[in-house]
């Protein structure tokens, strides 16, 4: 069966939107009005992995681009990157672990924990216009809570 996907945008809990910054980087910044059209649309695919009521494994691709968020070790540090894939083979139900995030819903907010690196989360800085990153903290200065906005296909 084909993998189930939906199109969406994400905003962090400070209402910053995610935009492309160069070919392989996302940044978080406040957008208004027509600038909202700059925000990236994700194709969120529901993939194979450990699942529970509030934890759902997903992959986050960029809509109509052969790019997926993935988690890899760089300089001994778990790092978030945008990775090119062969569009003929992706998305798929059994995604490699580096592409998988546990979507965790808490109080109507979403966290995205790396399946490859437990306790590391898609994060944004309090500061404006900084790259989105894989962070190792929760509940401090950096932001790990997001809201999801559905986008029609």
């Amino acid at each position: 069966a084909p993998v189930r996907s939906l199109n969406c945008t994400l905003r962090d809990s400070q209402q910053k939107s995610l935009v492309m910054s160069g070919p392989y980087e996302l940044k978080a910044l406040h957008l208004q009005g027509q600038d909202m059209e700059q925000q990236v649309v994700f194709s969120m695919s529901f993939v194979q992995g450990e699942e529970s009521n509030d934890k759902i494994p997903v992959a986050l691709g960029l809509k109509e681009k052969n790019l997926y968020l993935s988690c890899v070790l760089k300089d001994d540090k778990p790092t978030l990157q945008l990775e090119s894939v062969d569009p003929k083979n992706y998305p798929k139900k059994k995604m490699e672990k580096r592409f998988v995030f546990n979507k965790i819903e808490i109080n109507n907010k979403l966290e995205f924990e790396s399946a490859q690196f437990p306790n590391w989360y898609i994060s944004t800085s309090q500061a404006e216009n900084m790259p989105v990153f894989l962070g190792g903290t929760k509940g401090g200065q950096d932001i790990t809570d997001f809201t999801m906005q559905f986008v029609s296909s």
Partner: antibody, heavy 118, light 108 residues
């Protein structure tokens, strides 16, 4: 009130080890990156390494080649830095500091003077 | 690793005058630079984060600017209590976090 309180001054012989503590209060210990930065007498600031209390990840300056061990106790909100095989060049004030991911160190401990002398 | 180079090593400025401290990164760090003030016998104190954001409680005479590789810390009207060593530090690419060698600010 955010506070980082470090252990007291130490005098060690070359080849020995030293363990410095940093007790955090007034904030969520697991919500920040905890750094160790040192300053030799009359010199500048040098990053030693960091620990992430939330997931126990550590990374240090390659300069220290495995001589540095950083640990934490989340039950007491305390970070520790142990430096082994001490040499005279390790004489310095060692600071702990908290930061966000991009390293803005907004609170610092008072510093711990480690003196290495035979 | 990213090397941070500060200039000048020592700066002498008259009270009430403007002090301009520079920091250069060996590669593009965007705005991921932070400035610290350190007085003798004290721990460093964060002044400016992310190139231009003042930390809480920092007097308005301190400001930061720049992006990419060239950055500036400005003290608009020097006070005697501003005499200290100032350090820049990058957080764009770690490990390691790296500091500049410092600029010593003196009263002329």
């Amino acid at each position: 009130e955010v506070q980082l309180v470090q252990s007291g001054a130490e005098v060690k012989k070359p080849g020995a080890s030293v363990k410095v503590s940093c007790k955090a209060s007034g904030f969520s210990f697991t919500g920040y990156y905890m750094h160790w930065v040192r300053q030799a007498p009359g010199q500048g600031l040098e990053w030693v390494g960091l620990i992430i209390p939330h997931n126990d990840y550590t990374v240090n300056n390659q300069k220290f080649k495995g001589r540095v061990t950083m640990t934490r106790d989340t039950s007491t909100s305390t970070a520790y830095m142990e430096l082994s095989s001490l040499r005279s060049e390790d004489t310095a004030v060692y600071y702990c500091a908290r930061s966000d991911y991009y390293g803005a160190m907004d609170y610092w401990g008072q510093g711990t003077l480690v003196t290495v002398s035979s | 690793e990213i090397v941070m180079t500060q200039s000048p090593a020592t700066l002498s400025v008259s009270p009430g005058e403007r002090a301009t401290l520079s920091c250069r990164a060996s590669q593009n760090i965007g705005t991921s630079i932070h400035w610290y003030q350190q007085k003798p016998g004290q721990a460093p104190r964060l002044l400016i984060k992310y190139a231009s954001d003042s930390d809480y409680g920092i007097p308005a005479r301190f400001s930061g600017s720049g992006s990419g590789t060239e950055f500036t810390l400005t003290i608009s009207s020097l006070q005697s209590e501003d005499i200290a060593v100032y350090y820049c530090q990058q957080g764009a690419s770690w490990p390691p976090f790296t500091f500049g060698q410092g600029t010593k600010l003196e009263i002329k």
